[in-house]
Amino acid sequence: CDLPQTHSLGNRRALILLGQMGRISPFSCLKDRHDFRIPQEEFDGNQFQKAQAISVLHEMIQQTFNLFSTEDSSAAWEQSLLEKFSTELYQQLNDLEACVIQEVGVEETPLMNEDSILAVRKYFQRITLYLIERKYSPCAWEVVRAEIMRSLSFSTNLQKRLRRKD
């Protein structure tokens, strides 16, 4: 499955939108930094078969979509930017779902992939727990926004590596 060029453009657009969503100066939030233990090894495309990598990407985008689709998220961000961001993610999910169906038929996805998906889910659980603990404060959301920008950048790099493998 070849991810369309529009997919990587969508990823870039999503990153730009997320960059524009900040409402407060991040400089006031330094003390709120937190180690979410991003599962970096899951974004290393070299150790995966293509089907596995696409599944991990899909889980990453799905969890990001879920995180920014909550009521608490709606209250935190400017509505029109949030809607555009969610639309970009939704389009990426559609692209990836088509690929997941295509690729899983070609390769058997081993249990290792379930571990990778679980690692991504646990990562987002840590992010959600942090937001709950910080009572969804503006600074907590600002820290999460920075973290998601970082993980989306990792996703973009993984997609680039997948394209080079084709």
């Epitope: 960059g19 100066s25 330094l30 003390k31 180690d35 979410f36 970082r150």
Partner: antibody, heavy 121, light 107 residues
Framework: EVQLVQSGAEVKKPGESLKISCKGS????????IGWVRQMPGKGLEWMGI????????AYSPSFQGQVTISADKSISTAYLQWSSLKASDTAMYYC??????????????WGQGTLVTVSS | DIQMTQSPSSLSASVGDRVTITCRAS??????LNWYQQKPGKAPKLLIY???SLQSGVPSRFSGSGSGTDFTLTISSLQPEDFATYYC?????????FGQGTKVEIK
Amino acid sequence: EVQLVQSGAEVKKPGESLKISCKGSGYSFTSYWIGWVRQMPGKGLEWMGIIDPSDSDTAYSPSFQGQVTISADKSISTAYLQWSSLKASDTAMYYCARHPGLNWAPDFDYWGQGTLVTVSS
Amino acid sequence: DIQMTQSPSSLSASVGDRVTITCRASQSIDGALNWYQQKPGKAPKLLIYFASSLQSGVPSRFSGSGSGTDFTLTISSLQPEDFATYYCQQAYDFPLTFGQGTKVEIK
């Protein structure tokens, strides 16, 4: 390879203006903040201020607020430190360094080589 | 502003010695403390971040510990290339502040 390359040494007279630069390469320039640190001859490190190149938001140390201006041009991956009217006490080595912002990652992990500014009549 | 106080301001040691430098913050900074090494005429180099995380490429003889207000940098066995000035820096809040430095000299 991540690099921060600073502009060359400057010799100026009191009252003159100056703008020194710090060019980032080998990483996404807008994904990191750039901080500026002063070191006067034979003295320790003093944090001056910081900029987020993605939107040019800045924060200054109270000691340097109003004394210097920090700016950035993300199109050429360059941050700047400028003075409108230099004093002899501005004589120092100035370093830029990158900062991961709100991400949990090493602070000031890469530094420029420093720009020596000498102000003398 | 958060004040950072290092001790000692200088020390003399021999190759192979265990060296300990302490840093105290004027208020709690959790674990948001970094340690840097600077050699004459060179830019500072990050050694330890978030109190105890070893920066990539830094030898394991360097270690950091502490949280709250009291922090320690330890060099387990001093090497010739370790003679330098060491700075702590709080990364908890703006304005960021450095300790005054500890110069490690050859005995």
